[in-house]
Amino acid sequence: GMEVRWCATSDPEQHKCGNMSEAFREAGIQPSLLCVRGTSADHCVQLIAAQEADAITLDGGAIYEAGKEHGLKPVVGEVYDQEVGTSYYAVAVVRRSSHVTIDTLKGVKSCHTGINRTVGWNVPVGYLVESGRLSVMGCDVLKAVSDYFGGSCVPGAGETSYSESLCRLCRGDSSGEGVCDKSPLERYYDYSGAFRCLAEGAGDVAFVKHSTVLENTDGKTLPSWGQALLSQDFELLCRDGSRADVTEWRQCHLARVPAHAVVVRADTDGGLIFRLLNEGQRLFSHEGSSFQMFSSEAYGQKDLLFKDSTSELVPIATQTYEAWLGHEYLHAMKGLLCDPNRLPPYLRWCVLSTPEIQKCGDMAVAFRRQRLKPEIQCVSAKSPQHCMERIQAEQVDAVTLSGEDIYTAGKTYGLVPAAGEHYAPEDSSNSYYVVAVVRRDSSHAFTLDELRGKRSCHAGFGSPAGWDVPVGALIQRGFIRPKDCDVLTAVSEFFNASCVPVNNPKNYPSSLCALCVGDEQGRNKCVGNSQERYYGYRGAFRCLVENAGDVAFVRHTTVFDNTNGHNSEPWAAELRSEDYELLCPNGARAEVSQFAACNLAQIPPHAVMVRPDTNIFTVYGLLDKAQDLFGDDHNKNGFKMFDSSNYHGQDLLFKDATVRAVPVGEKTTYRGWLGLDYVAALEGMSSQQC
C-alpha cells in the first residue's frame, strides 16, 4: 500500500523516526511511515526531489531553497505560541537613549544570537542586503558584515576569516573561556545573550525575537545582569527609519519569521500528509503517551523531526513556499542566499561602440587589479535591443539602459534592474518630472480631468515631456481614444487647438499648429526648431504665458527657468513662479515647487538590467565597491567609472552625470523602477503602434 518516507538527517533523528514509525504502525495510522537516512537537510531535499524520500520538516531558509531550487511545497506547519500562531518576529533592539535607526546601522556595534541563526543573522543580514543598505561583493557576506558594523558578537564566527571583527564584542564565560562559542559558554549567545550584549553596553543594537526584551526585563529574568533592566529603556527599529516601543513588534519588525513546515514534492497530496501527522499528534503529543512527537529529550538532542516547542501541527492552505514564508522573510532570504560556489566568475557587460569597448576593457583591468569580483568581461552588440536579446540568451549578463529601453527589456525580454544611476540635483536633463502647467486662475480653474476642449502647448512632436508622456497618459486614462491608431487626429480632436511643432508636417492635422506663431516675421510657423517661438520647453511655456494656450506640457524645471528674473527675454522678464500651478493626476492643483508629488510621470534614471536569475545583490555589490575606488571623477586609482572624456565619447557604460550607483531596493521589476505613471504613458503610446 501507500507509504510516506520521512527523511532523517542524523542518527538521533533516525532513531526517533523509527520510534515514531513503530508508534504509528501500532496505532493503526495509515499510510505507513518509513524512515530514510539523509546526511543533511540539503541532502534530504535532493532525495525528496529525486523521489527517494517524501517528507521532511525544514526551517524558513531551507523551505526557500527547497521551493525555489527543487519545486517542493510546504503542506503542514508547526504552531508554537497561541498568541503569534505559525510564526514569530525578528526585531532589532536599541537603547532608548541612543540615536540609532535602521538607516544608521553602519559603524555601530552589533549583537547577534549566533552565526546563521534565523533572527540573529539570516533575517537582519538578508534584510540589510535586500534593502540596499549593505552591499556584498562576491557573495562574501561575512566580510561585508564585518566591514559594515563597528565590531560585533556573532557566536560561532570564531572559525571564520573575520573573527577579529565578528567576535570583537564577545566575552565568553565568567572565566573568559569559550569566547565567541556558539554555545552557552559565550555569555552573549542566544536570544538572551544577544540582548545582554546590548543591555551591558557592549553593543548598540541586538537582533533578537519579539519576545526577548519582555522576557528579560522588568524583573522577569533570574540572572543578576537583567535584574534592574526596564523594558521601557529599549526600543525597536522599524523598517521605515522610525523607532517604536518594544511592545509594538507586530508593526515594527524586520520580518515575520515563518514556523518550520513539512515539505513534500509538488505532486504529493498535502492533505494525506496532514491526516497522517494529525492522527499522530492526536495520540502522541500529550504527556504520558508512549511516544512523544514533540520531544527529543529521550534521544539526548533537541528539535528532532519537529521543534520541541511545537504545540500542534496545522494544515497549510496555500501550498506554495512564497505564501508560507511571506514577503518580508522571502525578501530577506533573497538578500542572504548567495552561494560563492555558484557565483559565475565573470560578469559579461554589453558594449555598443568602439569607445565603449575601450572603456569597458579599462574597467575590467582596473577591477581585476583591485580584486573586485566577479570579473568584468566585455561583449559587443549592435544596439540596446541586441544587448537585450543576448542577455536573454545568456550570452551576456548586464547592460545600462535608458527608460524606454528598460521598458522593452522588462516587457519583451523579461529583464530586471540590478542597480540604478543617481544624478546630482543640478543634472535635471537626465532624470526629470513631466508636468502640466496652467495659469493660477481662481475664476476659470480646471483640472487634469477637464482638459478636453482646452488649448494645449507642447515642446514638439515626439518630445518626452511635451508629447510622449502627456499624450500617453491621456490615452491610458481613457480621455483620448484614437481610432485606427491615429493618435495625431485623436489629439487634434481632443484639444480645441494646440501648438505641437514638427519636422515633417505631411498629413499633420492643422489644429496641432493652430497656436504656433513662427519667428518674429511670422514665418516658419510650427517648425520643429527654435525658429518657432513656441518650440521646445521654453517655447511651450511661452505659449501659455502669452495666453495662446491654457496648459503647457513641460519639464519640472521649465517654470523656474523662465520666471523670477531667471530669463531676461522681454516675454519672461517680469514673470513670477507663484502665478502658475501644476495639474495633478488626482484632480488637484499644486504649487510649481511641488513637482515631485504632482506630475504626470518621472523620466527615470538609467538602470543596469540583467536576467531575473542573476543575483542582483552581487551586481550591486560589485558596482558599490568599484565606485568607492573609481566613482569620484577626481580619483587617483587609474580609472573613472562615470567619466567618458578619456575615450572621446559620452555616457559610455554609465551616464557621465552619474554621481553614484544605487541599489534598486524595492524596485525589483522594470515597472517598479520606471514607476507606474511612466509605464502607463509608454503603454498608452505603444498601444497605438499598429
Partner: antibody, heavy 119, light 112 residues
Framework: QVQLQESGPGLVKPSETLSLTCTVS????????WNWIRQPPGKGLEYIGY???????YYNPSLKSRVTISRDTSKNQYSLKLSSVTAADTAVYYC?????????????WGQGTLVTVSS | DFVMTQSPLSLPVTLGQPASISCRAS???????????LHWYQQRPGQSPRLLIY???NRFSGVPDRFSGSGSGTDFTLKISRVEAEDVGVYYC?????????FGQGTKLEIK
C-alpha cells in the same frame, strides 16, 4: 518661514562617532535636498553631503568612508554621523537646504553647532 | 579636486564706496543644461552663512540691490555698489555644477 536647527553633543572623544540631528520646520524633508556643511575654526566651508527627497544619499568622496546621513520623515529630521573622528574634525557643523527655486544653492542654513573632538 | 580661487583674500573698504570680489573656477561651470551653478554667500561675524546670489546673478529674496553678481565660464565677480557697515564679514563663492559642491577660500571684507 523655513528654519533648520542643529542639535547634538558639543564634545566627542577621538575615535568615537559624531552624531548630529537637524530639525526642519516650515518645509518637508520629502522635497528638496538636505545638506551638511562644516567649517573648522577660522577656516573655510567644506561640503559633507546630502540626503535627497527620495532618501538617496551623496557624500563628499574625501569623507565618504566615515559619513552616514539618514532621515526620519515622521519627525521631519535628518541626521549626520561621522565615525572615527580626530581633532581635524573639530568644526562648526551646519545643516542647509537646497531646492530648485534657487538652482540648488543653499538657501536656508541652521545656526550651526560647534563640535570639539578632544579626549 | 575642483578648485575655486577667490581674490583678494582681504578687502578693506571705505563706507559708501564700491567693492568687488573675484572668483575663478579651475574648469568651466556651464552645466549640460546650459545653467551656470555659481552662488555667493555672506557670513557675518559669529553667524551662519547666508545666500546672497544664486546662478551667477540672481539675488536671493531679501538681499539688498546694492549686491550684484556677474561672470561666465570660469570667471565671476560679486560687486557691492556702496558698502554699508552691516556688510562686514566673509564672502564665499561656491559652485555646484560639479560634484561635490565646493567653496572658495573666502574674502574678508572690513571697513577701513
Amino acid at each position: 518661514q523655513v528654519q533648520l536647527q542643529e542639535s547634538g553633543p558639543g564634545l566627542v572623544k577621538p575615535s568615537e562617532t559624531l552624531s548630529l540631528t537637524c530639525t526642519v520646520s516650515g518645509d518637508s524633508i520629502t522635497s528638496g535636498y538636505w545638506n551638511w556643511i562644516r567649517q573648522p575654526p577660522g577656516k573655510g566651508l567644506e561640503y559633507i553631503g546630502y540626503i535627497s527627497d527620495s532618501g538617496i544619499t551623496y557624500y563628499n568622496p574625501s569623507l565618504k568612508s566615515r559619513v552616514t546621513i539618514s532621515r526620519d520623515t515622521s519627525k521631519n529630521q535628518y541626521s549626520l554621523k561621522l565615525s572615527s573622528v580626530t581633532a581635524a574634525d573639530t568644526a562648526v557643523y551646519y545643516c542647509a537646504r537646497r531646492t530648485l527655486a534657487t538652482y540648488y544653492a543653499m538657501d536656508y542654513w541652521g545656526q550651526g553647532t560647534l563640535v570639539t573632538v578632544s579626549s | 579636486d575642483f578648485v575655486m580661487t577667490q581674490s583678494p583674500l582681504s578687502l578693506p573698504v571705505t563706507l559708501g564706496q564700491p567693492a568687488s570680489i573675484s572668483c575663478r573656477a579651475s574648469q568651466s561651470l556651464v552645466a549640460s543644461d546650459g545653467n551656470t551653478y555659481l552662488h555667493w554667500y555672506q557670513q557675518r561675524p559669529g553667524q551662519s552663512p547666508r545666500l546672497l546670489i544664486y546662478r551667477v546673478s540672481n539675488r536671493f529674496s531679501g538681499v539688498p540691490d546694492r549686491f550684484s553678481g556677474s561672470g561666465s565660464g570660469t570667471d565671476f565677480t560679486l560687486k557691492i555698489s556702496r558698502v554699508e557697515a552691516e556688510d562686514v564679514g566673509v564672502y564665499y563663492c561656491s559652485q555646484s555644477t560639479h560634484v561635490p559642491p565646493t567653496f572658495g577660500q573666502g574674502t574678508k571684507l572690513e571697513i577701513k
